[in-house]
Interface confidence: low
């Protein structure tokens, strides 16, 4: 009985610019098939507990599953299938009419080149001078990968980093994001976003650490020279970063065009799709190049901002130049100017 738990099961994620997220396709005896989200008695709009697909993510050499549900846009290949029985079982599947099939999407965490520890070291009274210094980003519960409060550990001592807004630390932040295998520095996070606010029910090991550090050398090139130990402060900010490698990324689609490679740009916030509103920070094709790539089209041919004559037109707004830099989308409740993008078509 073939299921995605079987060792010889083959799957791939397509229609995205990452091998770790996209439309789920499976290899059965007669070739590759797109899996419809209506499989296993589910509704085409239903979101599943993503942990059920952890074996698929593992097999693709990706991290933990983040979402499992309807994919952004259904691109119907020659063959799409609806499967029956237990979730993840492929022993009883039938070919589906393409126009009836909504594809199933899976997003796994991008793999890390080296895995920094995700748990804090247990408190210990014995110093461990031989343990190399290391960093950790602590996200709020349900938060993002590569975003959160920075904790620094040297031997058995660990704690947050005291940070003053006037500190000129761009080089340091890039170094820290890089050291965490999280790309480059994007921005500082407010503590509420970074998850400093303590949940009263939080387990003991997530209480504030006893040590605090201060930035000693913002141009440091090895961790042991970056920080010095200070007495814990009751007030003041702690260093919290958003790095470019954050996950999950904003997903986009093009709707209302004559092909999959043109249309009005929409983005997904959770399970909801909404128009992406024009923003002065995106007056370059870098944003649209990314959108075109996500649709697996060629480069940008053109884009145009559609006039928002209607004061009630609503949508989502990304304050950064590229969508991949947007870890949050803001709602715009009036005068949302939509953007119509034309990418080079794979089938002109």
């Amino acid at each position: 009985r073939l299921s995605w738990y079987d060792p010889d099961f083959q799957a791939r994620l397509t229609r995205s610019n990452s091998k770790c997220q996209g439309q789920l396709e499976v290899y059965l005896k007669d070739g590759w098939h797109m899996v419809c989200s209506q499989s296993w008695g589910r509704s085409s709009k239903q979101w599943e507990d993503p942990s059920q697909a952890s074996k698929v993510c593992q097999r693709l050499n990706c991290g933990v599953p983040l979402s499992l549900g309807p994919f952004l846009v259904t691109y119907t290949p020659q063959s799409s299938i609806i499967c029956y029985g237990q979730l993840g079982s492929f022993s009883n599947c039938s070919h589906s009419r393409n126009d009836m099939c909504h594809s199933l999407g899976l997003t796994c965490l991008e793999p890390q080149k080296t895995t920094p520890p995700t748990t804090r070291p247990p408190p210990t009274t014995t110093p461990e001078p031989t343990a190399p210094p290391r960093l950790q980003l602590v996200a709020q519960s349900g938060g993002q990968h590569c975003a959160g409060v920075v904790e620094f550990y040297s031997g058995s001592l660990g704690g947050t980093i005291s940070y003053e807004a006037q500190d000129k630390t761009q080089d340091l932040e890039n170094f820290l994001c890089n050291n965490l295998q999280c790309g480059s520095f994007l921005k500082h996070l407010p503590e509420t976003e970074a998850g400093r606010a303590q949940d009263p029910g939080e387990p003991r090991e997530h209480q504030p650490l006893p040590i605090q550090w201060k930035i000693q050398n913002s141009s440091c090139t090895s961790l042991e020279h970056c920080f010095r130990k200070i007495k814990p402060q009751k007030s003041g900010r702690v260093l919290a970063l958003l790095c470019s490698g954050f996950q999950p990324k904003v997903q986009s689609r093009l709707v209302g065009g004559s092909s999959i490679c043109e249309g009005t740009v929409e983005v997904r916030q959770g399970a909801q799709w909404a128009a992406l509103c024009d923003s002065s920070s995106a007056r370059s094709s870098l944003r649209w190049e990314e959108v075109c790539r996500e649709q697996q089209c060629g480069s940008v041919n053109s884009y145009r901002v559609l006039d928002a004559g209607d004061p009630t037109s609503r949508g989502l707004f990304c304050p950064h130049q590229k969508l991949s830099q947007c870890h949050e989308l803001w709602e715009r409740n009036s005068y949302c100017k939509k953007v119509f993008v034309t990418c080079q078509d794979p089938n002109p």
Epitope: S285, L286, C297, G298, S299, V300, N301, S302, Q344, P346
Partner: antibody, heavy 119, light 108 residues
Framework: QVQLVQSGAEVKKPGASVKVSCKGS????????IHWVRQAPGQTLEWMGL????????SYNQKFQGRVTMTVDKSTSTAYMELSSLRSEDTAVYYC????????????WGQGTLVTVSS | EIVLTQSPGTLSLSPGERATLSCRTN???????LHWYQQKPGQSPRLLIY???NLASGVPTRFSGSGSGTDYTLTISRLEPEDFAVYFC?????????FGGGTKVEIK
């Protein structure tokens, strides 16, 4: 037939700028993006960036960000690439190439422009 | 960035012989975005094969391409005198777009 014709060879001093042109003919110029690729003597090819000929939007290789500027003049079907703050290692043949299809390949290339940077 | 490593650097063969050129990538690329170009001295590169195995217009059928993931191959079944040149692989699976270091096919 499709042709990309580039401007002639240039000799520049370190610190100067150079502007290379690439005129497209034999096809609808605004339907295909133009890439710029360079090749130092005896070396491999290095992608510098692309420009959408219909909108003028650009995507640059980070390595050249801040030094390269790509522009397009639709009225003359010409793309331009300007590289500033030249150094000796910028000595290379600079090619423009036409972007084709979703497979993202270059189906036609200009003849190349040799830029020599020397004091 | 995605690094493309071509081997061998130089291939010395006689006309009529078979040439096999390798292009390896440091991370998996989509076969749709792996292409091969030929360049002769003093000339611009010329598209040979696109999407791993599709012959570009006007390219003789003695050229063929194959591969997937991180391993790609260009094969010339019987070398003709005009085939002696440098061959580059190129990927556009990720930004920045990158080329391999090239393989020179020379007359033995």
């Amino acid at each position: 037939q499709v042709q990309l014709v580039q401007s002639g060879a240039e000799v520049k001093k370190p610190g100067a700028s150079v502007k290379v042109s690439c005129k497209g003919s034999g096809y609808t110029f605004t339907n295909f993006a133009i890439h710029w690729v360079r090749q130092a003597p005896g070396q491999t090819l290095e992608w510098m960036g692309l420009i959408s000929t219909s909108s003028g939007d650009v995507s640059y290789n980070q390595k050249f960000q801040g030094r390269v500027t790509m522009t397009v003049d639709k009225s003359t079907s010409t793309a331009y690439m300007e590289l500033s703050s030249l150094r000796s290692e910028d000595t290379a043949v600079y090619y423009c190439a036409r972007h084709y299809g979703a497979n993202n390949y270059f189906d036609y290339w200009g003849q190349g422009t040799l830029v020599t940077v020397s004091s | 960035e995605i690094v493309l490593t071509q081997s061998p650097g130089t291939l010395s063969l006689s006309p009529g012989e078979r040439a096999t050129l390798s292009c390896r990538t440091n991370s998996s690329v989509s076969s749709s975005y792996l292409h091969w170009y030929q360049q002769k001295p003093g000339q611009s590169p010329r598209l040979l094969i696109y999407g791993t195995s599709n012959l570009a217009s006007g390219v003789p059928t003695r050229f063929s391409g194959s591969g997937s993931g991180t391993d790609y191959t260009l094969t010339i079944s019987r070398l003709e005198p005009e085939d002696f040149a440098v061959y580059f692989c190129q990927q556009y699976s990720g930004y920045p777009l990158t080329f391999g270091g090239g393989t020179k096919v020379e007359i033995k």
